[in-house]
């Protein structure tokens, strides 16, 4: 049986999809849709790229990898049980019937009930996707406390406070990408 990709309610899901651009920057349109790949295009499109950039996306769906190098893997934020199912990644290679189609099965597991850590407070509402790691593994949004105004000095301070948290090792080992907004 084909493998399934997994995520837990409330976490992000990551669905892999890769192609090799003919030359660096020589991109091919890609679409992601909910449901198996139809004969043409994607059904229920959630994200689309063209030859240059992401030109359509819906809330909670984004590309975390370097899509200019052919990494068009999909991130679905804050998944619910309703996000379970088949997703289509379609690499729209020019020419008749040249498209590469990938159907990926996503399984959502119920959230585990665990006591809230005492040192962490909710931060994501004010600053969604602000601190994410890149490199070895999945992007992880860290919840650090409500700060209405933030600057690089504060981010540095926050990173220090992260030493004992779940993300600390990834920040050290993978390096961090800081994204605002």
């Amino acid at each position: 049986s084909e493998v399934e990709y997994r995520a837990e309610v409330g976490q992000n899901a990551y669905l892999p999809c890769f192609y090799t651009p003919a030359a660096p920057g020589n991109l091919v349109p890609v679409c992601w849709g909910k449901g198996a790949c139809p004969v043409f295009e994607c059904g229920n499109v959630v994200l689309r790229t063209d030859e240059r950039d992401v030109n359509y996306w819906t809330s909670r769906y984004w590309l975390n990898g370097d899509f200019r190098k052919g990494d068009v893997s999909l991130t679905i934020e804050n998944v619910t049980l309703a996000d379970s199912g088949i997703y289509c990644c379609r690499i729209q290679i020019p020419g008749i019937m040249n498209d590469e189609k990938f159907n990926l099965k996503l399984v959502i597991k119920p959230a585990k009930v665990t006591p809230a850590p005492t040192r962490q407070r909710d931060f994501t509402a004010a600053f969604p996707r602000m601190l994410t790691t890149r490199g070895h593994g999945p992007a992880e949004t860290q919840t650090l406390g409500s700060l209405p105004d933030i600057n690089l000095t504060q981010i540095s301070t926050l990173a220090n406070e992260l030493r004992d948290s779940r993300l600390a090792n990834d920040l050290r080992d993978s390096g961090a990408t800081i994204r605002i907004g």
Partner: antibody, heavy 120, light 107 residues
Framework: QVQLQQSGPQLVRPGASVQISCKAS????????LHWLKQRPGQGLEWIGM????????RLNQKFKDKATLTVDKSSSTAYMQLSSPTSEDSAVYYC?????????????WGQGTTLTVSS | DIVLTQSPATLSVTPGDRVSLSCRAS??????LHWYQQKSHESPRLLIK???HSISGIPSKFSGTGSGTDFTLSFNSVETEDFGMYFC?????????FGAGTKLELK
């Protein structure tokens, strides 16, 4: 840096249960699946199974379902594989390996391997 | 189970040669194919993921191509440090499976 440190070589009698450990460091232990693999001398690699350290959910290769039991101890970031009723066929090098991207089913970091010898 | 067939089983080369290793799947696996290098008495090391995508820290001389059932790992100029075993692995279907490997040795 990301590291997986496995327990040392073991010599066991046939039928005596054996446990191999794999201590993870340098990353968030519960954020990536951990896989176990078998390699017999001069042979290829076999995937035994995997465990999700966040909730201990496992998936085993059917070939090993009566042979291997996978567990984790989150407090020490350590994974364990227990092999039941070992025979000479179980003599091999066993590896733990971290999933390349949470749950994408390739292996980007490997332990150094644990040599198991089953002999009377 | 998906069977991965690697060829040749052994390849004898001279440093500086260009090398291509083949991996063929018993059924279509899209591009869910990954390549590993294993030197003697060492653990395997990931070289290429998803058929053609490079891995941070791996020399750029390694490249992969293919999709569906036929895949190739190439390197443009073999060095002595490249000798060892090369394995392909599929992540399309359970159970995850590996090829038997290609041994790259000095001619």
């Amino acid at each position: 840096q990301v590291q997986l440190q496995q327990s040392g070589p073991q010599l066991v009698r046939p039928g005596a249960s054996v446990q191999i450990s794999c201590k993870a460091s340098g990353y968030s232990f519960t954020s990536y699946l951990l896989h176990w693999l078998k390699q017999r001398p001069g042979q290829g690699l076999e995937w035994i199974g995997m465990i999700d350290p966040s909730d201990s959910e496992t998936r085993l290769n059917q070939k090993f379902k009566d042979k291997a039991t996978l567990t984790v101890d989150k407090s020490s970031s350590t994974a364990y594989m227990q092999l039941s009723s070992p025979t000479s066929e179980d003599s091999a090098v066993y590896y733990c390996a971290r999933d390349g991207y949470y749950a994408w089913y390739y292996f980007d970091c490997w332990g150094q391997g644990t040599t198991l010898t089953v002999s009377s | 189970d998906i069977v991965l067939t690697q060829s040749p089983a052994t390849l004898s080369v001279t440093p500086g040669d260009r090398v291509s290793l083949s991996c063929r799947a018993s059924q279509s696996i899209g591009n869910n194919l990954h390549w590993y290098q294993q030197k003697s008495h060492e653990s395997p090391r990931l070289l290429i993921k998803y058929a053609s995508h490079s891995i941070s820290g791996i020399p750029s001389k390694f490249s992969g191509t293919g999709s569906g059932t036929d895949f190739t790992l190439s390197f443009n100029s073999v060095e002595t440090e490249d000798f060892g075993m090369y394995f392909c692995q599929q992540s399309n279907s359970w159970p995850l499976t590996f090829g038997a490997g290609t041994k790259l040795e000095l001619k």
